[in-house]
Interface confidence: low
């Protein structure tokens, strides 16, 4: 099949006092293979301070994952997700507040 | 190789402006930050800010914030730093270094001396 | 602003003996976010530890690293003649970036 970029979402919660859970959701996209990390001051976070989701079909022929990571709150701004799926990469910024931001990735 | 290299030695006069490159080269110039320090004479070392180049995100050190920019061209893999009205304090050598893991600084400009002197 | 005090602000040392300097942060930091530098006359400084314990590249094994929370401890083994120079940690926990003031190992 043709290929299909990923929709990217990222959002925040609240994890404990002084910390959030920041979370970046990519879904809608083929083939399966795609890279998502968080990275911070422009640089990917270790392996041991991310978690990832599977990467499932959402029953549309695309598929989804995710990957969340803990911060501290007022240090969002320097935290981005980064995605590359066939040969396209993408950053994506943490909202400010409870807001939050998805974007579909353009060839 | 990964280098960075900065621009020439700057005298300038209070009240001016100074603008330093830092060239990168041997890595992929949109894939780490760019920061700036800076060190006056004798004494520690100072952040300034930095700079992430795929996004031109820019976060500065509040204590600079009125008087500093700082920009890049990727097009170049150049770096600039621009701090305005100048003082005999601002007499410094000035840094550009590549963001490492966790927000270390693990490549280095040779500097840039800015001497500020009526 | 996180605020390092390193100490002793000058160490004078002979060749093959032991260095031991402090870096005492204000606040906590993690480990992963504490680094060390070393600085020689008219050069850039260079990176030497990363996340207290990380050796950078190229550098010899005699330079350790330790601690955790406030307190952070970088070692020279035995001092080499190059190894004189001003040494400064550094953390990138929180904003501002912050470095310590720096200590002089000198010959003694």
């Known amino acids: 099949g043709s290929t299909v970029p990923p929709m990217v979402n990222v959002t925040r919660s609240e994890a404990s006092e002084g910390n959030i859970t920041v979370t970046c959701r990519a879904s809608g996209f083929y083939p399966w293979n795609i890279t998502l990390s968080w990275r911070q001051d422009g640089v990917s976070l270790s392996h041991d301070t991310q978690q990832w989701g599977d990467v499932l079909p959402d029953g549309n022929g695309t598929y989804q994952t995710w990957v969340a990571t803990r911060i501290c709150q007022g240090e969002e701004q320097r935290f981005t997700c980064y995605m590359e799926h066939s040969g396209n990469h993408s950053t994506h910024p943490v909202p400010s507040g409870n807001s939050h931001h998805h974007h579909h990735h353009h060839h | 190789e990964v280098q960075l290299v900065q621009s020439g030695a700057e005298v300038k006069k209070p009240g001016a402006s100074v603008k330093v490159s830092c060239k990168a080269s041997g890595y992929a110039f949109t894939s780490n930050n760019i920061y700036w320090v800076r060190q006056a004479p004798g004494q520690g070392l100072e952040w300034i800010g930095y700079i992430d180049p795929y996004i031109g995100r820019i976060i500065y050190n509040q204590q600079f914030k009125d008087r500093v920019t700082i920009t890049a061209d990727t097009s170049t893999s150049t770096a600039y730093l621009e701090l305005s009205s100048l003082r005999s304090e601002d007499t410094a050598v000035y840094y550009c270094?590549?963001?490492?893991?966790?927000?270390?600084?693990?490549?280095w400009g040779q500097g840039t001396l800015v001497t500020v002197s009526s | 602003e996180i605020v390092l005090t390193q100490s002793p602000a000058t160490l004078s040392l002979s060749p093959g003996e032991r260095a031991t300097l402090s870096c005492s942060a204000s606040s906590s930091i993690s480990s992963n976010y504490l680094h060390w530098y070393q600085q020689k006359p008219g050069q850039a400084p260079r990176l030497l530890i990363y996340r207290t314990s990380n050796l950078a590249s190229g550098i010899p094994a005699r330079f350790s690293g330790s601690g955790s929370g406030t307190d952070f401890t970088l070692t020279i083994s035995s001092l080499e003649p190059e190894d004189f120079a001003v040494y400064y940690c550094?953390?990138?926990?929180?904003?501002?970036?912050?470095f310590g003031q720096g200590t002089k190992v000198e010959i003694k």
């Open positions: 270094s590549r963001s490492g893991e966790r927000s270390n600084f693990d490549y």
């Open positions: 550094q953390q990138g926990g929180s904003l501002p970036l912050t």
